[in-house]
């Protein structure tokens, strides 16, 4: 009886009300192996999710999020609001980066700017809310009397240190 | 599986210095903020900052400002800490932990096993 | 700046339910994620609630988090406590998005 069952391609279930014959899967359900004794119910892409491939017999249906919103999590199991560049998520909503932060992105978290000094060179364009510094040669390479901009000691960040 | 691996306990002498790593696997190490945290004997968890590895970026709490130095070695996926002018208070278990990139409030998701370190003369 | 204040110790039965408090001094509580981590003797801490109400995977079902606007507070609740519960419970949030606050703790004993 096991091997009877084996022989049931996707898209159906081995119905053991029915001698265990292969029946195809019911509408809004799939098996995508062989051998199921049942189908899965196809997932539904409502609110927040938009249906990106439509449920077969065969494969479950795929969601994505709807405008203003982006995927989180395997198979995109979560949808997350998205911020303006220059923000980050938190629990009251989109937020501004803190001062000596930045994202490029409409979602993730803020970043600190890069650590010019670390490669022992120096800020040639200052970082904003919406984009990192831009390093440039180390001090010693400038010319005699050139300067480099350096952001302002950081005010409302207890020590942040984006150089 | 994600990992957090943090070097030996140490005992040190009062003005020195002493340097705890935290060797990070099984994650993109440059993509999440590692914090360093501090816990003294029978006391509650202290914050002392933070490192992006991705670009070196660090913060510092007020009261380890001058005295913590937070760096990452990102070919070994490691951060360090390391903290000068050691004083007897400063004898505590330290921790680095991640925090997912989800928002900007997260949790700290993975925890190193804790360093403990020792100051006295 | 933000301050999270907890009781030193909470004890409680076997089989009974505990609820460890976390206080916000100022603001409003719903505008905070507040996440509770659990830390035995000599161990590391570990995440039992996370963004106000989520349990991380294997984290049992009696572990549960909320929180009370009129109070501002938010709790961890511990349903049918058990002996191995007995521990020090931390919660945690941020003063801005780059630092984090934690609350005192509260040691867990079971009677």
């Known amino acids: 009886l096991q091997d009877l069952c084996s022989n049931c391609p996707a898209g159906t279930f081995c119905d053991n009300n029915r001698s265990q014959i292969c029946s195809p899967c019911p509408p809004n359900s799939f098996s995508s192996a062989g051998g199921q004794r049942t189908c899965d119910i196809c997932r539904q892409c409502k609110g927040v999710f938009k249906t990106r491939k439509e449920c077969s017999s065969t494969s479950n249906a795929e969601c994505d999020c709807i405008s203003g919103y982006h995927c989180l999590g395997a198979e995109c199991s979560m949808c997350e609001q998205d911020c303006k560049q220059g923000q980050e998520l938190t629990k009251k909503g989109c937020k501004d980066c803190c001062f000596g932060t930045f994202n490029d992105q409409k979602r993730g978290i803020c970043r600190p700017w890069t650590n010019c000094s670390l490669d022992g060179k120096s800020v040639l364009v200052n970082g904003t809310k919406e984009r990192d510094v831009v390093c440039g040669p180390s001090p010693a390479d400038l010319s005699p009397g050139a300067s480099s901009a350096t952001p302002p000691a950081p005010a409302r960040e207890p020590g942040h240190s984006p150089q | 599986e994600v990992q957090l691996v943090q070097s030996g306990a140490e005992v040190k002498k009062p003005g020195s210095s002493v340097k705890v790593s935290c060797k990070a696997s099984g994650y993109t190490f440059t993509s999440y903020y590692i914090y360093w945290v501090r816990q003294a004997p029978g006391q509650g968890l202290e914050w002392i900052g933070n490192i992006w590895p991705g670009n070196g970026g660090t913060f510092y709490g007020e009261k380890f400002m001058g005295r913590a130095t937070f760096t990452a070695d990102t070919s070994t996926s490691t951060a360090y800490m390391e903290l000068s002018s050691l004083r007897s208070e400063d004898t505590a278990v330290y921790y680095c932990?991640?925090?997912?990139?989800?928002?900007?409030?997260?949790?700290?998701?993975?925890w190193g096993q804790g360093t403990l370190v020792t100051v006295s003369s | 700046s933000v301050e999270l204040t907890q009781p030193p110790s909470v004890s409680v039965s076997p089989g009974q339910t505990a609820r460890i408090t976390c206080k916000l001094n100022?603001?409003?509580?719903?505008?905070?994620?507040v996440h509770w981590y659990q830390q035995k003797p000599g161990q590391a801490p570990v995440t039992m609630i996370y963004?106000?109400?989520?349990?991380p995977d294997g984290i049992p079902e009696r572990f549960s988090g909320s929180s009370d606007s009129s109070s501002n507070s938010a709790f961890l609740t511990i349903s049918g406590v058990q002996a191995e519960d007995e521990a020090d419970y931390y919660c945690h949030s941020y003063d801005s998005t780059i630092t984090p606050v934690f609350g005192g703790g509260t040691k867990l004993t079971v009677l």
């Open positions: 100022s603001g409003n509580i719903g505008s905070y994620y």
């Open positions: 932990a991640r925090r997912p990139d989800y928002s900007g409030d997260d949790y700290f998701d993975y």
């Open positions: 963004r106000d109400d989520k349990r």
